[in-house]
């Protein structure tokens, strides 16, 4: 039922598939970079402007004409902390999710010219300025180099780097994707004296190999080989070092001092999972056992007389979980006080909610400074008087985000800084603080159009609106836009939240087809107050389909009882809860229970496939994009966090009975579209290949699409347009829409 009577009365156009694919209606951002406690940079018409936060006046920091003769397309820029140099990035070549190589040049802002001597080599893997001054550290060919002055020769810090084997200062595939969410494994001390770095050894890590077909003229496909530890396989090993960059010499090689992992880690496989400088000469390291329910924080001090780093056992802090794993995805980072003698950290409390705890480095126990049946999402800033954090406390809505400050001299004095600023338009905030937290930018991302504002911490006064998306607002007035419903259902006395993107002129007395948009991985959240223009907007607006998402057991930000429910049992409760959600939606009266579909990508593709293979009879059809199909095929760090090891002594049985392939027979009852990129370095094409084989083996007719040379994002312009067009046709056919 497309509600044609309503649509006829409303002459406005709908949000079409073309609108989504061509990005007709663009959300405007306001991306600033703080360069001091009162100034930020903002790019406008390719000029770099410097703004005064207090008064809002700006001046041109760098004109767009400066590099007209440069001869390269500049991908990014980075200004040295002392404002004397600008690092220009070009020849960007993507590697994995975060990693890339590029070329770099340095422009002297005083002399207004490019530095031509002692240039950084092409294909550099990572570059970073020191936190003060203008030292540079970079990684090239898996080795680390330091420049004390941009125009002087580099000092080589490491000599052991070897492609796919030894990684100095950069992460290997699994550390990049699952531990640090970054390519960089370098950490400058606050004043730039010391450079800490990790070294990863992948000598024994098995390789994933896949074909890359490249240009049509390539007669033989290239084979890509990546060290990738799958569940239960040999993992990379890690070592940690610190080098003093103030004592580098061109005569002798740099001396890196190793800090070894705690004894409780060295007894077996382990990971380095966090590095945080506490002071100029104190560093904290967090280590995690391969079985990720036990972590240790070491606090290490520099001993000037020996040049070594001492980590006292008395200062070790152990974090463990008896119900699941440590942290949301890994142990949270500590936020140290100025003297480095204490820190604040988000950990699980006794009730299983993640809150801020105050630690003194010499004491084992900590004091919780927040509490409640809600969670702290992140610590955003720490000053001598206040700690600023984002939480989902307000109105008991896990899918909301607000900025709070807590007085450090009296933990009962908590103020919500964002809750009532624009309560209708803005319920989901993130924040960017100036260097010493004197000012902050609030970024509101929904439920209304995004709004960017600037504020002073002195009195929490709003200074000005930076971007209100008013131009987009005007444009969308002429479009029949869907509305978004955020609510919850109660199952077994527990609240579970869902969202629905409802068609324009939604009428609860009518029946609508429903598409369940699923992710459902551990600590995921799909029901929130964020405004989005996406495929669901098109489906609801033009095709009158309700697009729903449900956060069941395993989802995040609502306590460990819900999140740890799927510990060691992926493919069970989170799958069952999506089916139950669809049943509940059917009972609401406005859903056509003969036209319910499900779709998901990655973990969502796995859940979609497990749901369709469950034989529930609830779903007519579904689409799985780049799905996991068997947990032994996915990487060790992610998989083992939730599943343990695939060994008979540990959890092999559940690894084997949580596969999509074992449910092949039930796919005869549904219409299935399976999609995967052939160059997916993350969820390997192997995973869909095995689903396909199992379905063929039992005689299931299904639809499939591969995307040649596409990775996990299927994000190239042509592939992106193709996949969403293809999925739209499939859904329309499934729902018998014209």
């Amino acid at each position: 039922n497309k509600g044609t009577d309503d649509a006829t009365a409303d002459s406005r156009k709908t949000y079409t598939l073309t609108d989504y694919l061509k990005n007709t209606y663009r959300l405007k951002l306001y991306s600033l970079r703080w360069i001091s406690d009162h100034e930020y940079l903002y790019k406008q018409e390719n000029n770099i402007l410097v703004f005064n936060a207090e008064y809002g006046n700006s001046s041109v920091f760098l004109e767009n004409s400066t590099f007209d003769e440069f001869g390269h397309s500049i991908n990014d820029y980075s200004i040295s902390p002392d404002g004397q140099f600008i690092l220009l990035e070009y020849n960007y070549v993507k590697q994995w999710r975060h990693s890339y190589t590029a070329s770099y040049d340095i422009y002297d802002l005083n002399k207004r010219q490019l530095i031509t001597e002692e240039r950084i080599p092409n294909n550099t893997q990572w570059v970073t300025w020191s936190p003060v001054g203008h030292k540079l550290a970079y990684v090239w060919n898996n080795d680390i180099y330091v420049k004390i002055e941009p125009n002087l020769p580099s000092y080589r810090i490491t000599w052991t780097g070897k492609e796919d084997i030894i990684y100095n200062g950069i992460t290997d595939w699994v550390y990049e994707e699952e531990v640090f969410s970054a390519y960089s494994a370098l950490w400058w001390s606050p004043n730039g004296t010391f450079l800490a770095y990790a070294q990863f050894n992948d000598t024994e890590v098995p390789l994933i190999e896949y074909s890359f077909y490249s240009d049509e003229s390539l007669q033989y496909p290239k084979t890509v080989r990546v060290p990738y530890p799958k569940a239960g396989a040999v993992n990379p090993t890690v070592k940690f070092f610190v080098v003093n960059t103030d004592s580098l010499s061109s005569v002798t090689n740099a001396t890196s001092i190793q800090i070894t992992a705690p004894a409780s880690m060295l007894i077996g496989d382990h990971y380095l999972c966090d590095v945080t400088w506490a002071t100029q000469e104190r560093i904290s390291l967090q280590w995690l056992r391969r079985i990720q329910n036990y972590s240790v924080m070491d606090i290490c001090d520099y001993d000037e007389s020996s040049g070594r780093w001492n980590c006292l056992v008395a200062r070790q802090h152990i974090e463990m979980s008896t119900t699941g794993w440590v942290g949301r995805f890994r142990p949270s980072e500590p936020h140290f006080t100025l003297d480095g003698n204490s820190f604040y950290k988000i950990i699980s409390n006794e009730e299983g909610y993640r809150h801020i705890c105050y630690f003194q480095i010499d004491k084992k126990d900590c004091t919780f400074i927040t509490k409640g049946t809600w969670e702290v999402i992140g610590i955003e800033a720490l000053t001598s008087d206040y700690l600023y954090y984002i939480s989902n406390e307000y109105k008991g809505m896990p899918g909301g985000r607000n900025l709070y400050k807590i007085q450090l001299s009296d933990y009962t004095k908590v103020t919500c800084l964002s809750c009532e600023l624009n309560p209708e338009r803005c319920q989901y905030y993130s924040v960017s603080f100036s260097k010493e937290a004197k000012y902050y930018q609030l970024r509101c991302s929904g439920p209304g159009l995004p709004l960017y504002t600037l504020h002073s911490s002195v009195n929490d006064k709003g200074l000005r609106v930076l971007e209100d998306n008013s131009a987009l607002d005007k444009m969308l007035q002429n479009v029949q836009m869907p509305s978004k419903k955020l609510d919850f259902i109660i199952l077994n006395e527990t609240k579970f939240w869902y969202q629905m993107i409802l068609p324009p002129h939604f009428d609860k007395s009518k029946k609508y087809p429903l598409l369940l948009d699923v992710y459902a991985g551990p600590c995921s959240q799909k029901a929130d107050t964020v405004f989005r223009l996406n495929w669901a907007t098109y489906l609801a607006s033009t095709e009158n389909i309700i697009v729903a998402s449900f956060d069941g057991r395993g989802s995040g930000y609502q306590g460990d009882k819900i999140m740890h429910a799927i510990n060691r049992r992926l493919g069970t409760f989170e799958v069952e809860d999506q089916i139950e959600a669809a049943r509940q939606f059917s009972k609401m009266g406005f859903v056509d229970n003969k036209r319910i579909a499900i779709w998901g990508w990655s973990y969502g593709g796995y859940v979609t496939s497990m749901v369709l293979g469950s034989g529930s009879g609830v779903f007519k059809c579904g689409i799985a994009v780049a799905p996991v199909s068997r947990w032994e095929y996915y990487d060790s760090v992610y998989t083992e966090r939730y599943m343990g090891l695939p060994t008979p002594e540990d959890n092999l049985d559940h690894y084997r009975n949580s596969t999509v392939m074992s449910r092949a027979e039930n796919f005869k009852q549904v219409e299935y579209l399976l999609i995967h990129g052939t160059a997916d370095d993350n969820v390997h094409f192997q995973q869909s290949a095995q689903i396909s084989k199992a379905l063929v083996d039992v005689g299931v007719d299904f639809q499939a699409m591969w995307y040649t040379d596409e990775d996990h994002g299927i994000a190239s312009s042509t592939a992106h347009q193709h996949i969403y067009t293809h999925m739209s046709h499939f859904i329309k056919q499934c729902f018998s829409l014209p």
């Epitope: 109105k395 209708e424 338009r425 836009m481 509305s483 419903k485 955020l486 609510d487 609240k495 107050t529």
Partner: antibody, heavy 120, light 106 residues
Amino acid sequence: EVQLQESGAELVKPGASVKLSCKASGYTFRSYDINWVRQRPEQGLEWIGWIFPGDGSTKYNEKFKGKATLTTDKSSSTAYMQLSRLTSEDSAVYFCARWTVVGPGYFDVWGAGTTVTVSS
Amino acid sequence: QIVLTQSPAIMSASPGEKVTITCSASSSVSYMNWFQQKPGTSPKLWIYSTSNLASGVPARFSGSGSGTSYSLTISRMEAEDAATYYCQQRSSYPNTFGGGTKLEIK
């Protein structure tokens, strides 16, 4: 079915206080704001304030601070509004209304209203 | 506080006639909600988030606007549409309502 049932009409003397009730049914009471709105005879609507039963937090229109006090009893899913130091100006129909979270939200369910008459 | 001014305060329309009620805000608001109230009853949600019709509201109603200027339109007036209509904002505290537009049938 989601419903808000308000208490019966009140005739009170000037200077006295009155406590109005609003009993919720058909939904999870603790999870939605209850708002109170005043409508004087032949006049428009004025928002008094809201209370969030989940944690008891409140927000008042400055105009009604000291005049209205909002409370809830979660065990009986009932919201209350106490009006103090009543004058003839307070004679009105008082509505309770639920604020729902759909996109930016709105008052989706209203009580039938309680008529308060202040007279000596 | 944000003052909402509705116009006209009172109007009458013939069946089939197009009706537009405007609501002007003293400063910019993000969304406008509209309520219908008939004598002796509580207000009913009619249009939410500027342009979305509440459940059961006939398709002849529509809402539009942004910033400080919003409107409710009836494409073809019917007898059952005779009522008082209020606009309401919650973009900043306190929540405020317009003074109401009384719509009568000719």
